[in-house]
């Protein structure tokens, strides 16, 4: 896992920046782990960043991610009259200038270096779930969530009409 000292250095600057033409309503520096307490880690390999889901050794430091929160209208047609209200969307940045991206064609989650404004693929609707968990739904593909597959992050289609276990799309956020 690579160091995240850059995150702390640019957190303050981000408060006054413009990512999508609007400023984030708030920011939160947190470690990201799965429902089963595996850590999400980031590693530089062959000049690109890889994302892993792994058990950390005792006392091994967790990687941190900067979550930037934004207000957004619901993306679906149901919200045409605004009755669905506003939601919270987030971008996730583990190190300066890099953000998690949804690659809907490959059903993968990738780290991309980005110019601002960030593309829609970098935005995720934040779902407040019970058990102190959250889920991240692709802004660009409603019903598709970040999830865990084969010790990697992947995009997983969640259909409310299906009987499926969603523990693999639940994540915990922790300041420690």
């Amino acid at each position: 896992a690579f160091g995240i000292s850059g995150v702390q250095k640019y957190t303050r600057a981000l408060h006054d920046s413009s990512i999508t033409g609007i400023s984030p309503i708030t920011e939160y520096l947190a470690s990201l782990s799965t429902y089963n307490d595996q850590s999400i880690t980031f590693a530089l390999e062959d000049e690109s960043y890889e994302i892993y889901v792994e058990d950390l050794k005792k006392d091994e430091k967790k990687d941190k991610v900067l979550l930037s929160y934004y207000e957004s209208q619901h993306p679906s047609n149901e919200s045409g009259d605004g009755v669905d209200g506003k939601m919270l969307m987030v971008t996730l940045s583990p190190t300066k200038d890099f953000w998690l991206h949804a690659n809907n064609k490959e059903h993968s989650v990738e780290l991309h270096k980005c110019e601002k404004p960030l593309p829609d693929q970098a935005f995720f609707v934040l779902h407040n779930m019970h058990s102190n968990c959250v889920s991240f739904e692709c802004k660009t593909d409603p019903g598709v969530f970040i999830g865990v597959k084969d010790n990697h992050l992947a995009l997983i289609k969640v259909d409310s009409s299906e009987n499926l276990c969603t523990e693999n799309i639940l994540f915990k956020l922790s300041e420690t």
Epitope: E78, V83, H127
Partner: antibody, heavy 121, light 111 residues
Framework: EVQLVESGGGLVQPGGSLRLSCAAS????????MNWVRQAPGKGLEWMAE??????????HYAESVKGRFTISRDNSKNTVYLQMNSLRAEDTAVYYC????????????WGQGTLVTVSS | DIVMTQSPDSLAVSLGERATINCRAS??????????LNWYQQKPGQPPKLLIF???SQGSGVPDRFSGSGSGTDFTLTISSLQAEDVAVYYC?????????FGQGTKVEIK
């Protein structure tokens, strides 16, 4: 138009039972967490119960004051959420509102008009 | 349970003047870097209506004169310039922990 319409309220004796229904329309009912909130005459709001989605195993949560007496359930094929109320007490007298949480589950943003339940002998 | 306490219980404000309502939680309602604190308006004979969520974000269609602030345990709802249609009871609510709890309400009237 997004709408929640409650029914089933009325006068019931202490110790009796009542089942409230809430018919939803104008949105994809199966995608939303549903709640019941009550308001005693001239008093404030009190959250009662919540039911989540199929892929959350339809988990349910209750206020301590009604746990074991009230049961929330849903029928997605009928776009309806229910509140089964047993062992009713005088202090359960209230207007009962059916309410939908927003997409993402941050707040309640759709409410029914409410149905009055009166528990009295 | 998290206890929500509002002050004052009632408030009389002249039209066009500022109205301020306070809400205190018995413990922090912050989680995931946001405050799980909502404000609702209820007019007589009507169900509540969302005004503010996560302490400071306006609900859809809510007039700009309504704003929210605060974090942790102390929160404020401000009506910058009271209008006749703002006469109502206002409730704060925490949605961090079950049971979700409301404040006792603050009645706002015209002076």
């Amino acid at each position: 138009e997004v709408q929640l319409v409650e029914s089933g309220g009325g006068l019931v004796q202490p110790g009796g039972s009542l089942r409230l229904s809430c018919a939803a329309s104008g949105f994809t009912f199966s995608n939303y967490w549903m709640n019941w909130v009550r308001q005693a005459p001239g008093k404030g709001l009190e959250w009662m119960a919540e039911i989540t989605l199929k892929f959350n195993d339809y988990s349910t949560h209750y206020a301590e004051s009604v746990k074991g007496r009230f049961t929330i359930s849903r029928d997605n094929s009928k776009n309806t959420v229910y509140l089964q109320m047993n062992s009713l007490r005088a202090e359960d007298t209230a207007v009962y509102y059916c309410a939908r949480r927003n997409y993402g589950n941050w707040y309640i943003n759709v409410w029914g008009q409410g149905t009055l339940v009166t528990v009295s002998s | 349970d998290i206890v929500m306490t509002q002050s004052p219980d009632s408030l009389a404000v002249s039209l066009g003047e500022r109205a301020t309502i306070n809400c205190r939680a018995s413990e922090s309602v912050d989680k995931f870097g946001v405050s799980f604190l909502n404000w609702y308006q209820q007019k007589p004979g009507q169900p509540p209506k969302l005004l503010i969520f996560v302490a400071s974000s306006q609900g859809s269609g809510v007039p700009d004169r309504f704003s929210g602030s605060g974090s942790g345990t102390d929160f404020t709802l401000t009506i910058s310039s009271l209008q006749a249609e703002d006469v109502a009871v206002y409730y704060c609510q925490q949605s961090k922990d079950i049971p979700y709890t409301f404040g006792q309400g603050t009645k706002v009237e015209i002076k």
